[in-house]
Interface confidence: low
Amino acid sequence: EVEKTACPSGKKAREIDESLIFYKKWELEACVDAALLATQMDRVNAIPFTYEQLDVLKHKLDELYPQGYPESVIQHLGYLFLKMSPEDIRKWNVTSLETLKALLEVNKGHEMSPQVATLIDRFVKGRGQLDKDTLDTLTAFYPGYLCSLSPEELSSVPPSSIWAVRPQDLDTCDPRQLDVLYPKARLAFQNMNGSEYFVKIQSFLGGAPTEDLKALSQQNVSMDLATFMKLRTDAVLPLTVAEVQKLLGPHVEGLKAEERHRPVRDWILRQRQDDLDTLGLGLQG
């Protein structure tokens, strides 16, 4: 806390500019009007203030807006955002995607901080659902964002948003999350033709039920082993040897290398040896 002192003669700030970088903390407190700061927030980031000076500027904004900053100020916080606590951010009402992007840009290149997590939470809750533009933005900054959500939170993702999801966005999702996302993806991509559909749905197949895998096996999709290994074990077990052969196409030979790993191991144990022998891979049930 900077103690209240009168502003020295001739030092009252008429605008937020470079001259302020040499003001001591108490001078900033005494000579910079909070309302002026709020209207010229966009200039702060172009001025080389020290961390200590930024603390004073934040304190002034906190006094001006004890109930939380208006979006007009939030949008121009820039690196002052890094000074905010999650408690500060919980007071905000952020509705503009441009504001969200501006603040995510500040944190770019860093891990998701508690501040960013709180900001995203406030934004998504304010919108009521995770729409495509928001998801597009969030996954661009944080590829792992989608998989950081609970299945309950993912249930608010509309199928139309699934178009924004890239394969790498699902890398860290667990089966429970894919169980929620897969039906949405199936709905989103339902009007695509066979080969295009498979390219889009492939990343989501960890949530696919047996009947969908059976249907895919009839479409010459040539699923790679990496995708096959991510399928739900309970969905793979009922598949016949013939169906797995059709599903994998030329990749079926890869089963040998994975015979000790789930779901391949469990699937092999469910098959008749005669059927396995038709693959000519030496798999032992």
Epitope: N45, A46, I47, P48, T50, G78, G109, H110
Partner: nanobody, 129 residues
Framework: QVKLVESGGGSVQAGGSLRLSCAAS????????MGWFRQAPGKEREGVAK????????YYADSVKGRFTISQDRRNNTLYLQMNSLAPEDTGMYYC??????????????????????WGQGTQVTVSS
């Protein structure tokens, strides 16, 4: 890692001159501010002079204007502070600092932002009357 090493401090009579140097290393991204700060015993640290090495713009505290000159040798990554007409109130520890970052893609958004996150160990300047 960004490293800043100051030198050139010392004791001098009032009215004398000193030239401080700051050797910087560890950058992959060249734009940002470098500056000189000082701290007298028991006082708050204050900015003395800063330079934006994108366009060479310089900024000075009122108390040193016309007496101190900040400059840089970009080829050798060295910052200087030429101090003339020194007075006893200029006594203190002088620190070199920068907001240039070691990670080239982090600071591209607002390269002029002044987070002076990297500091040297300081060099002592003593001016006696």
């Amino acid at each position: 890692q960004v490293k800043l090493v100051e030198s050139g401090g010392g004791s001098v009579q009032a009215g004398g001159s000193l030239r401080l140097s700051c050797a910087a290393s560890g950058y992959t991204y060249s734009y940002g501010y470098m500056g000189w700060f000082r701290q007298a015993p028991g006082k708050e640290r204050e900015g003395v002079a800063k330079i934006y090495n994108g366009d060479g713009s310089t900024y000075y505290a009122d108390s040193v204007k016309g007496r101190f000159t900040i400059s840089q040798d970009r080829r050798n990554n060295t910052l200087y502070l030429q101090m003339n007409s020194l007075a006893p109130e200029d006594t203190g520890m002088y620190y070199c600092a920068t907001n240039r970052l070691p990670n080239s893609d982090v600071d591209l958004v607002l390269p002029r932002f002044g987070r002076f996150g990297y500091w040297g160990q300081g060099t002592q300047v003593t001016v006696s009357s």
